[in-house]
Structures are given as C-alpha cells and as structure tokens.
C-alpha cells in the first residue's frame, strides 16, 4: 500500500512506497522538504479564530461546508461554515452534518448513507507500480440502472473528494489531484491566509478528520507568526 508514502497527505511522494518507512500514521510530516518549485508549497498560517476561506466544500472540515457568510452575500467571498444539524434548512448535501443529507431543503438522517449510494459509474485506470493495488478511480455520474463502484484508494487520481474512499480526500499532489488521507489528531494541518492561497501548494494537505479542527499547537503560541505550527486538535 502507499500507506507511509501518502501519510499526512503525502507530503513525501512515493519513494519507499511499499512497506517503506517514510513516516507513520501518527507522524506530523512536514511539507515536502527541499521542494523548490517557485511559489509552491507556501503553507501560510493565520490566527485560528479567523474564518477559513474556501472555494469548495472539500476544502473545509467534515463538519463544515463552504458558503458565503451572509445570505445573498458576495459569492466571491466564501468561508467554511458550521454544518447544519438535522431538520435545519439546506441547499445541498455538504451543508448537512455527517450522518445527514439534504432532502427537500431539509437536513435529514442518511440512514445507511442513503444519498451516497447514488448510482455511480466506475472508471478505473491503472497506474502506480507493479506491486500496488491502489489504482482504482471512480467518477460520479447519474445512471438509470443500479451499479456498484470502487472508490479511489490512496494515491488514485481524483476529481473531487467524493471520488475517494472513506477517510480520504482529493487534494493536489505536484500538478495533479490524488486521494490522500484525511488528517488524524496531532497531524500537521494547513491554514490559509486568504482565498485561493491553496493554489500555490504543490502538496496540498487534506482537512482534519471528524471532530477535529486545525488550530495552532499550544506550545507554539510563543513562536513567531510565520512559524506557528497548526495541528488537528479535538474541538
């Protein structure tokens, strides 16, 4: 598996891909040490109480969605907002908290992941090395007959996070997008200073997992603004 390679969102690419020791799940891997692409990999930090700018839902945590903070507000300014609980109004599935989906404008329980079971077409392409089985990739489309699919595994190229298996998100790696692990507690995460800054990252990290948020590590409060380390922490 690509376990160690794409751990902490991969920030180390495949060298010891299979069974290699490039860090372990709990490790806080730094961002691609030594990568020298101009403008690339600039992980900027902000105070954790400021809103988190976003362009799409995938950039927010699992308990957040991306939208304009004011009703009918400027569509160009979007931030990550807290997800809507059951029986709250919604316009799309991502607005509802995990375990719920948007039905007729209201967040309802997704009993057995109802909406995620939409008909999906599988498009599988092989890539990676001979020993790797992580070459599945699926794209969501609506079909008239029921089909089952294999979601993209770690390292699979993806279009959006819904293409990736559970526990993975779709994030940039070099100049493409691949499925990477959602961050666990204690792992280094990225806070963006302004909307669009994520576009400068050659290696984009996933968001923090459910129940976690990206905050300044407590023992780093004294550090200078530019070197503050953010990690995934319990709410």
């Amino acid at each position: 598996t690509l376990n160690s390679v794409l751990n902490s969102n991969a920030i180390k690419n495949l060298p010891p891909p299979l069974g290699g020791a490039a860090g372990h799940p709990g490790s806080a891997v730094s961002a691609a040490p030594g990568i020298l692409y101009p403008g690339g990999n600039k992980y900027q930090t902000i105070d954790n109480y400021q809103p988190y700018p976003c362009a799409e839902d995938e950039e927010c945590g699992t308990d957040e969605y991306c939208a304009s903070p004011t009703r009918g507000g400027d569509a160009g300014v979007q931030i990550c907002l807290a997800c809507r609980k059951r029986r709250k109004r919604c316009m799309r599935h991502a607005m509802c908290c995990p375990g719920n989906y948007c039905k007729n404008g209201i967040c309802v329980s997704s009993d057995q992941n109802h909406f995620r079971g939409e008909i999906e077409e599988t498009i599988t392409e092989s890539f990676g090395n001979d020993h790797s089985t992580l070459d599945g990739y699926s794209r969501r489309t609506t079909l008239s007959s029921k089909m089952y699919h294999t979601k993209g595994q770690e390292g699979s190229v993806c279009l959006r996070s819904s293409d990736c298996a559970s526990g993975l998100c779709c994030a940039r790696h070099f100049w493409s997008k691949i499925c990477k692990p959602v961050l666990k507690e204690g792992q280094v995460c990225t806070k963006h200073r302004r909307k669009g800054s994520h576009g400068l990252e050659i290696f984009q990290r996933c968001y923090c997992g459910e129940g976690l948020s990206c905050r300044i590590q407590k023992d780093h409060h004294q550090a200078s603004n530019s070197s503050r380390l953010h990690t995934c922490q319990r709410h």
């Epitope: 390679v5 020298l36 890539f127 794209r139």
Partner: antibody
Framework: QVQLVESGGGVVQPGRSLRLSCAAS????????MHWVRQAPGKGLEWVAV????????YYADSVKGRFTFSRDNSKNTLYLQMNSLRAEDTAVYYC????????????WGQGTLVTVSS | EIVLTQSPGTLSLSPGERATLSCRAS???????LAWYQQKPGQAPRLLIY???SRATGIPDRFSGSGSGTDFTLTISRLEPEDFAVYYC?????????FGQGTRLEIK
C-alpha cells in the same frame, strides 16, 4: 485507452509564431497535471513546461520563459502551447505528456510533433 | 538547476547480461524524486521507474531502480533483445525538471 495526440508542428521562420495542440482522451483529463517535453534531432530530452490540473498554475523552462505560453481547455480535453519569437534552437520534436499523479514523472506520452525553425 | 550526469555514455552488452546504468545529480534530489525512461528510435519515451525505485505499470521485474541523494542506478538484471535503447533519468524534486543526457545501451 489513454491517448495523447499532438498537432500543429511544421516549418516556421525565426521570430515567427506557432501553436501546438494536444488532444487527450481515455482518462479524466481535468484531474491531471500535463507537461510539454521536447527533443532536438539526435539529442536528449528537455522539459519545457507544466500546467496544473485546473490551469491555475504554470511553470516554464528558462529557455522558453516569456516566449511560450501553456494553456488548457478542460471542456475540450485539449492542451495548447503557444510559441512566439521562435529561434533555431527551438527546433525539436514536441511531446505532450501526462503526469503520473503520485509523481511528476510522465506515464503517457504523445507521438510528438516536429517543429522546425529555419529561414 | 539540478544537472543530471549519466554514465557511461554508451554501454555495449550482450543479451542475458546484467546492465548497470548510473545517474549522478549535481545536488541532492529531494525525497528521491527521480525517474527512469527508455526510448527507442522514432518512439516517445516510456516510463520505467519513478520515486527512484518504484516500477511503473507493466514494466518487467528485470528492471529495478535504486539509490538516494545524488547517486542513482537503473539495473536490468538479464538483458532481453528489446531492452537495447537509450535510457534517461529525470529529477522532479526541484524546478526546473531536468533530464540526464542519456545512456545508449547497444548490442555487443
């Protein structure tokens, strides 16, 4: 199956322009970073430029910076390389190549299109 | 930029023999971001190895990559007639991406 087909090559005078195209099929084009690599006759490979999956990010080799522009149209699954102020040393076979995804190495290449800059 | 120097320039061997191709970088290649390609006359290059040691899809296991830092090696354990070609190394750990000048593997 994955296919990359370049077109637009030909003979052009120094200082003139040319636009190469690369039509992609058989894969989810809008998820992949794409590159141009060239090879002068009888010589080795030279990386020319890269464009990110969404076209927001581009980098160029110093030898072509300011003269070449790389763009993509994800709705048409097509890449473009606009080459201006061409020089004799730009004479080469130009390949478009797909990035592997998990590595910035190139797993699929087109057949190449020859650009000859000569007076 | 990182300059990659391949040696030897030409390697003459017979089918069945072991081939060892070297690629040396002018500075350390970040995270072993190094790839190897094979190119035959009139054809586009073919990816063999990425990440210094990971075989690309469909590549026979007689091809293996090793090395780290500044010294990398492509080994073909037992040469087949179709292996005679030009081999290039490529680094993608820093901008610009660069290729070595190539090693020609010819039949003795």
């Amino acid at each position: 199956q994955v296919q990359l087909v370049e077109s637009g090559g030909g003979v052009v005078q120094p200082g003139r322009s040319l636009r190469l195209s690369c039509a992609a099929s058989g894969f989810t084009f809008s998820s992949y970073g794409m590159h141009w690599v060239r090879q002068a006759p009888g010589k080795g490979l030279e990386w020319v430029a890269v464009i990110s999956y969404d076209g927001s990010d581009k980098y160029y080799a110093d030898s072509v910076k300011g003269r070449f522009t790389f763009s993509r149209d994800n709705s048409k699954n097509t890449l473009y390389l606009q080459m201006n102020s061409l020089r004799a040393e730009d004479t080469a076979v130009y390949y478009c190549a797909r990035e592997l995804g998990i590595a910035a190495s190139f797993d699929y290449w087109g057949q190449g299109t020859l650009v000859t800059v000569s007076s | 930029e990182i300059v990659l120097t391949q040696s030897p320039g030409t390697l003459s061997l017979s089918p069945g023999e072991r081939a060892t191709l070297s690629c040396r970088a002018s500075q350390s290649v970040s995270s072993n971001y190094l790839a190897w390609y094979q190119q035959k006359p009139g054809q586009a290059p073919r990816l063999l190895i990425y990440g210094a040691s990971s075989r690309a899809t469909g590549i026979p296991d007689r091809f293996s990559g090793s090395g780290s830092g500044t010294d990398f090696t492509l080994t073909i354990s037992r040469l087949e007639p179709e292996d005679f070609a030009v081999y290039y190394c490529q680094q993608y750990g820093s901008s610009p991406i660069t290729f070595g000048q190539g090693t020609r593997l010819e039949i003795k």
